[in-house]
């Protein structure tokens, strides 16, 4: 399987909420002996490999934000962490995997990485990640709502998030 990032860039005004999304593509084994470990973290550009550096999101580590479940299950981070930090990572039955950040500030700007590890019973692992940029803007140049830019080079038209 692969991980797709529907949008490579999110431009949002301060105070807005945003949901960053990744999607599992290709055949996803939903067998009993397969589980998926999913998490989010911040990283930085200009490295040899994107997403190799694992920095916290609003002081929450990749362990705090992880989801661990069978291939056909939905999952969410703890309500307690979501409430306290304005963050929630979630995964649905259709391969969508997201993190919602509430009340954005300029400090939230940066590169975000989603990671999916497919774990087969006894040993083998398949690890893939996706990356996307969040730009939080303030002042008169800031958009009134989040504007998202598709990753696909063919589809360069801006989409305004609802």
């Amino acid at each position: 399987f692969k991980v797709a990032t529907p949008y490579s860039l999110y431009v949002c005004p301060e105070g807005q909420n945003v949901t960053l999304t990744c999607r599992l593509l290709g055949p996803v084994d939903k067998g009993h002996d397969v589980t998926f470990y999913k998490t989010w973290y911040r990283s930085s550009r200009g490295e040899v490999q994107t997403c190799s550096e694992r920095r916290p999101i609003r002081n929450l580590t990749f362990q705090d934000l992880h989801l661990h479940h069978g291939g056909h299950q939905a999952a969410n981070t703890s309500h307690d962490l979501a409430q306290r930090h304005g963050l929630e990572s979630a995964s649905d039955h259709h391969g969508n995997f997201s993190i919602t950040m509430r009340n954005l500030t300029l400090l939230d700007s940066g590169l975000y990485c989603c990671l999916v590890v497919e774990i087969r019973h006894h040993h083998s692992e398949h690890r893939v990640h996706g990356a996307m940029e969040l730009q939080v803007q303030t002042g008169k140049d800031a958009p009134s709502n989040c504007v998202v830019y598709p990753s696909s080079s063919q589809d360069s038209e801006n989409i305004t998030a609802a």
Epitope: R55, P56, T61, H68, I119, H121
Partner: antibody, heavy 117, light 110 residues
Framework: QSVEESGGRLVTPGTPLTLACTVS????????MSWVRQAPGKGLEWIGI?????ITYYANWAKGRFTISKTSTTVDLKFTSPTTEDTATYFC??????????????WGPGTLVTVSS | AYDMTQTPASAEVAVGGTVTINCQAS??????LAWYQQKPGQRPKLLIY???TLASGVSSRFKGSGSGTDYTLTISGVQCDDAATYYC????????????FGGGTEVVVK
Amino acid sequence: QSVEESGGRLVTPGTPLTLACTVSGIDLSTNVMSWVRQAPGKGLEWIGIIFDSDITYYANWAKGRFTISKTSTTVDLKFTSPTTEDTATYFCARYDTYGYSYSIDLWGPGTLVTVSS
Amino acid sequence: AYDMTQTPASAEVAVGGTVTINCQASEDIYNLLAWYQQKPGQRPKLLIYRASTLASGVSSRFKGSGSGTDYTLTISGVQCDDAATYYCQQGHSSRNVDNAFGGGTEVVVK
């Protein structure tokens, strides 16, 4: 790859004490490390963890009693004010966070701290 | 708070026999459970991670199972060298932890 603890000794209660864990072949900027202790004849007790991003978490009983920090080559465990209950062997250990199993795949040999008046 | 309860505290088993050790987490730990073997004067040795995956070089006589809050380590065809104390450890969370390790089970081989 290896880790080794040092600094364990006999101290009186309240005496400042810091243990050091020196790593070899391990990049502390990309690895997650932990301290675990074991009182004589007792079980393993998790003290806390320091992430590659420098974020630290402590066991509920250890909060305020210890501070974990790191440099590029060492992970330190600082005792706030040792008591006789802190007499134990202290292990430095590495978490497997690239296989995302969060098991401890590398342990040091341990260093003995004795707190006695 | 995350806490691990391990039973029994000690178990006696004959050579060739089978011993079962249980570990219960205070909350769901989503299979992020490891088992360790420790002999007197030595550092712990990783046996099993993610509840059921055997660590490199570990005998297949060791088997881990379980899910949710309840996990089991089974040692079959017990040998004299298996005499040790065994510990479980949860890796699901580092927040609000009382102890990530179970209290240990001493296995005595007759």
